[in-house]
Interface confidence: low
């Protein structure tokens, strides 16, 4: 469902690299001219997730079955139990915590895998490569298991997974296959277990962009079971903007406004834009182009 | 109808603790973000921050950060509001504040308020 | 942080008459402005939402305009029951601010 979003995502990378744009996500349709400076809770680090649908909240269903079921916390980020209902619902949803947290959860990077060359590495290295849905593009390496090589693509700056590597050198040392193969102790000093962070503990540069809104903000548009086609708007996380949709009547998602505004006023404020101390990067519509140093590299942020 | 029920007054000394709550009736409890609203005397009025009660997410003021903690009773519908080490700047009244729509954030419902006061 | 200015601190009318209090925000904020009323010793009451949208059960008198920095609440023709401090309130950024409020009191 939502790995659909893929080539968006890259079609989206490669605009932003030809046109030479690092694109503000915060940049709702044009007739909204305001400036948005979110701060929240900001204890714990930049939460990534190993998959897009763990930032689901969960959803019991319509049906009427009481049945015992786990999903991911974006708030504790901590798996939980929830009631099922027995249909429908979303992805965020397990059988079993053991489940959950496999698929959730940081903690279960810290599991060894054994390839068939009998050489050790984590689970994260098999991962695809994975933008995320943020725009903030950055360079940032990731294994490919197809080449067995570290190779570099442009992240997104939010969300993504764990094959994420800041470095060349570093993604080399966590998942290539190095000359006396994988050492579980250069992994154990690379990665905090402790934190859900779900970034190499060496990458030292946090998210250039972070969504702290109501996670349905981040599902896609989701038509239903119905045969209606009623007009509704969804927000759409990969540009930033409020869309049209239509919907079946029944089902789908929480990202169903019955107006533009409504959908603007519940997702739009969620995105904030990070510098490397922890300082916030105001965007300002009005300006044409903004330039913003940040302590690893000078990038422009424009407006699209 | 839509009501939002608030603990009675309370006279505290300074570097004590006092939890506020606040009980709603007449919709889904956890459907909506529950805001925290403080007003001293004489003054206007200050976010201190939410909280989702489906989920227990918060969101303060960084103003208020560390100094007021927000948690949720689902079972009794109850929302509340521990503050802490207080001193007489934190005599005031506070509102526990429903939101009209999700995440809209203008305050369409308002309890009748704590009146909190720290002496000594 | 959005600082919300209001203007003027005090206004003194006469039933009947007409009257509008002003609230500045220091940046843009398009129109994510609410207005409130509240009496002596009571709790604060949403008047207008979203600079210009009316409130059920609000008096028709009320009424609020404005977009950008510039907002303005009117009363087209006050009545005693009017008399209270009146706060705007912007929700186009966190953390949430109020403005420093408007006493309306009778000449």
């Known amino acids: 469902m939502i790995y659909t979003m893929k080539k968006v995502h890259a079609l989206w990378a490669s605009v932003c690299l030809l046109l030479n744009l690092a694109p503000a996500p915060l940049n709702a349709d044009s007739e909204e001219d305001e400036e948005h400076t979110i701060i929240t809770d900001t204890e714990l680090p930049p939460l990534k997730l190993m998959h897009s649908f763990c930032a689901f909240k969960a959803d019991d269903g319509p049906c009427k079955a009481i049945m015992k079921r786990f999903f991911f916390n974006i708030f504790t980020r901590q798996c939980e139990e929830f009631i099922y209902g027995g249909c429908e619902g979303n992805q965020n949803r397990f059988e079993s915590l053991e489940e959950c947290k496999k698929m959730c959860t940081r903690d279960n990077a810290n599991r060894i895998i054994k390839t068939t060359l009998q050489q050790e590495k984590p689970d994260f290295c098999f991962l695809e490569e994975d933008p995320g849905i943020c725009r903030g593009y950055i360079t940032r390496y990731f294994y490919n298991n197809q080449t067995k090589q570290c190779e570099r693509f442009k992240y997104g700056g939010c969300l993504g997974n764990m094959n994420n590597f800041e470095t060349l050198e570093e993604c080399k040392n966590i998942c290539e296959d190095g000359p006396n193969g994988f050492q579980v102790d250069n992994y154990g000093t690379q990665l905090n277990a402790v934190n859900n962070s779900l970034t190499p503990q060496s990458t030292k540069v946090p998210s250039l962009f972070e969504f702290h809104g109501p996670s349905w903000c981040l599902t896609p548009a989701d038509r239903g079971l119905c045969r209606a086609n009623e007009n509704r708007f969804y927000y759409n996380s990969v540009i930033g903007k409020c869309r049209p949709f239509k919907y079946s009547g029944c089902g789908g998602n929480e990202n169903n406004f019955t107006s533009k505004q409504e959908c603007l006023r519940a997702c739009k404020k969620g995105f904030i834009q990070r510098i490397s101390k922890g300082g916030l990067i105001k965007t300002k519509r009005k300006r044409k182009k903004q330039r913003v140093k940040i302590a690893y590299e000078e990038i422009f942020v424009k407006n699209m | 109808e839509i009501q939002l029920q608030q603990s009675g007054p309370e006279l505290v000394k300074p570097g004590a603790s006092v939890k506020v709550s606040c009980k709603a009736s007449?919709?889904?409890?956890?459907?909506?973000?529950m805001y925290w609203v403080k007003q001293s005397h004489g003054k206007s009025l200050e976010w201190i921050g939410y909280i989702d009660p489906y989920s227990g997410g918060t969101s303060y003021n960084q103003k208020f950060k560390g100094e007021a903690t927000l948690t949720v009773d689902k079972s009794s519908s109850t929302a509340f509001m521990h503050l802490n080490s207080l001193t007489s700047e934190d005599s005031a009244v506070y509102y526990c504040?429903?939101?009209?729509?999700?995440?809209?954030?203008?305050?369409?419902?308002w309890g009748q308020g704590t009146l909190v006061t720290v002496s000594a | 942080d959005i600082l919300l200015t209001q203007s003027p601190a005090i206004l003194s009318v006469s039933p009947g008459e007409r009257v509008s209090f002003s609230c500045r925000a220091s940046q843009s904020i398009g129109t994510s402005i609410h207005w409130y009323q509240q009496r002596t010793n009571g709790s604060p009451r949403l008047l207008i939402k979203?600079?210009?949208e009316s409130i059920s059960g609000i008096p028709s008198r009320f009424s609020g305009s404005g977009s950008g920095t510039d907002f303005t609440l009117s009363i087209n023709s006050v009545e005693s029951e009017d008399i209270a401090d009146y706060y705007c309130q912007q929700s186009s950024s966190w953390p949430l601010t109020f403005g420093a409020g408007t006493k309306l009191e009778l000449k």
């Open positions: 504040v429903r939101e009209g729509n999700r995440y809209d954030e203008r305050f369409t419902y």
């Open positions: 007449g919709y889904s409890f956890t459907d909506y973000n």
């Open positions: 979203y600079a210009s």
